[in-house]
């Protein structure tokens, strides 16, 4: 009669929970039985983000910190079942916590838009295209961002128009701009639940051009034209 290690009821335990659950919420549980009928003590291994705790008697798993789907989902940890008393033999199983997305990331620019410029003086109103993104999950369809100017004072000089759910066009309303950098604030709304808004800045330079690029004194890089 050889003492055997505890046996988990499943190789992998899986649970699904919203990423915004309150700290202390039960997010799942595991069960194992000992062939000799001994009690089981449960513990976690590999909880690298410090998100979970397990009740060592019942095998229930609770959140102990805010969860974040954007940090990676599913979140995988190992569960160890050790027999209480006896030879303290143990077995290992997996617990996978699938985090359901909550709209908790405001929109932002999809890339670095430094270096945008128009050749000065403008011969006609100009425009440039920019792209927005966010880190939330967009099932079945892409993001549906809406775009507007970040402050009323910009409306005399600029207008923003939506191209699609992720792209918009920033256009000048006239040609009378000074030879300098303008910082254009754009408000991007993700239309989610709850809707989140990001205000981003697009730095646009009006500069003298040489062969289609901004002329800079020696030692400065040439920038490419973006209209």
């Amino acid at each position: 009669d050889v003492n055997e290690a505890p046996q988990f009821s499943q190789h992998v335990f899986q649970a699904k929970v919203s990423e915004d659950v309150a700290i202390g919420t039960k997010v799942g549980n595991v069960t194992a039985k000992d062939p000799e009928g001994l009690d089981i003590s449960y513990s976690l291994r590999g909880d690298t983000r410090g998100w979970l705790k397990i009740d060592h008697v019942t095998g229930e798993i609770f959140s102990v910190a805010p969860l974040d789907r954007e940090a990676g989902s599913p979140y995988r940890v190992q569960v160890v079942a050790t027999e209480v008393g006896g030879s303290s033999l143990s077995s290992v199983s997996e617990f996978h916590l699938i985090l359901m997305d909550v709209n908790d990331n405001p929109p932002r620019l999809a890339k670095d838009y430094t270096g945008l410029f128009f050749c000065h003086p403008l011969s006609a109103p100009g425009s440039l295209i920019f792209e927005a993104t966010d880190d939330d999950q967009h099932l079945f369809r892409g993001p549906h961002f809406t775009f507007s100017l970040g402050s009323g004072s910009l409306q005399n000089d600029w207008e923003v128009s939506k191209i699609n759910g992720t792209h918009a066009r920033l256009s000048t309303r006239h040609t009378e701009f000074e030879e300098r950098e303008y910082v254009v604030l754009i408000r991007i709304n993700d239309g989610g639940r709850p809707p989140l808004e990001g205000i981003v800045s697009l730095p646009v330079t009006f500069c003298s051009c040489v062969e289609g690029s901004c002329f800079r004194p020696a030692g400065h890089k040439h920038h490419h034209h973006h209209h």
Epitope: S41, H56, T58, T82, V84
Partner: antibody, heavy 117, light 108 residues
């Protein structure tokens, strides 16, 4: 026979800590979980938490998390429960109990802890 | 947390009576982890019944337990003088373990 023998009554001032011991005899402490349950005068039973003496794993009731510490000394077959930041409502009889399959089959005789200024 | 509610809170009965105490859980409890304890004044609780219906060692057969889900009962078929005490149900299906508020059984 199997028994759990607890330390004697304690009188403490508010804000102090108390450490109650529970010595197992007739069996090896590491063979079972040890639980702590308290009972305020004239009141019912309240589970405080549990410890597995084999590796020190513990589970505390949310109400006591941060104030209670359960430990064991396997060399003396003794479990301990320390409760800090005592207040008058912590006046109670504190019991240790051994569990098997989550039922408490052996209980200590209880330790009266009085918190009074 | 699972709340355990016992009824009645107190009960007067005579020797030889059949007595039933009920325990209702606020959510479903595994019958494997439902216990009953007896406590006499100045003494530690004593295990009577474990896993809903199993008699603990040395407990007389006049005690019995039954139930499932959220409703459980403790029955004493014929009260004896030594049975006058306070009775508690306990669940450990889910953490934290919780007890009923107790039922005090007194002599009529």
């Amino acid at each position: 026979q199997v028994q759990l023998v607890q330390s004697g009554a304690e009188v403490k001032k508010p804000g102090a800590s108390v450490k109650v011991s529970c010595k197992a005899s007739g069996y090896t402490l590491t063979s079972n979980n040890i639980h702590w349950v308290r009972q305020a005068p004239g009141q019912g039973l309240e589970w405080m938490g549990a410890i597995y003496p084999g590796n020190g794993d513990n589970s505390y009731a949310q109400k006591f998390t941060g104030r209670v510490t359960m430990t064991v000394d396997t060399s003396t077959n003794t479990a301990y429960m320390e409760l800090s930041s005592l207040r008058s409502e912590d006046t109670a009889v504190y019991y240790c109990a051994r569990s098997f399959r989550r039922y408490f089959d052996v209980w200590g005789q209880g330790t009266m802890v009085t918190v009074s200024s | 947390d699972i709340q355990m509610t016992q009824s009645p809170s107190s009960l007067s009965a005579s020797v030889g009576d059949r007595v039933t105490i009920t325990c209702r859980a606020s959510s479903s409890v595994s019958s494997s982890y439902l216990q009953w304890y007896q406590q006499k004044p100045g003494k530690a609780p004593k295990l009577l019944i474990y896993s809903t219906s199993n008699l603990a060692s040395g407990v007389p057969s006049r005690f019995s337990g039954s139930g499932s889900g959220t409703d459980f009962t403790l029955t004493i078929s014929s009260l004896q003088p030594e049975d006058f005490a306070t009775y508690y149900c306990q669940q450990y299906s889910s953490s934290p373990s919780t007890f009923g508020q107790g039922t005090k059984l007194e002599i009529k």
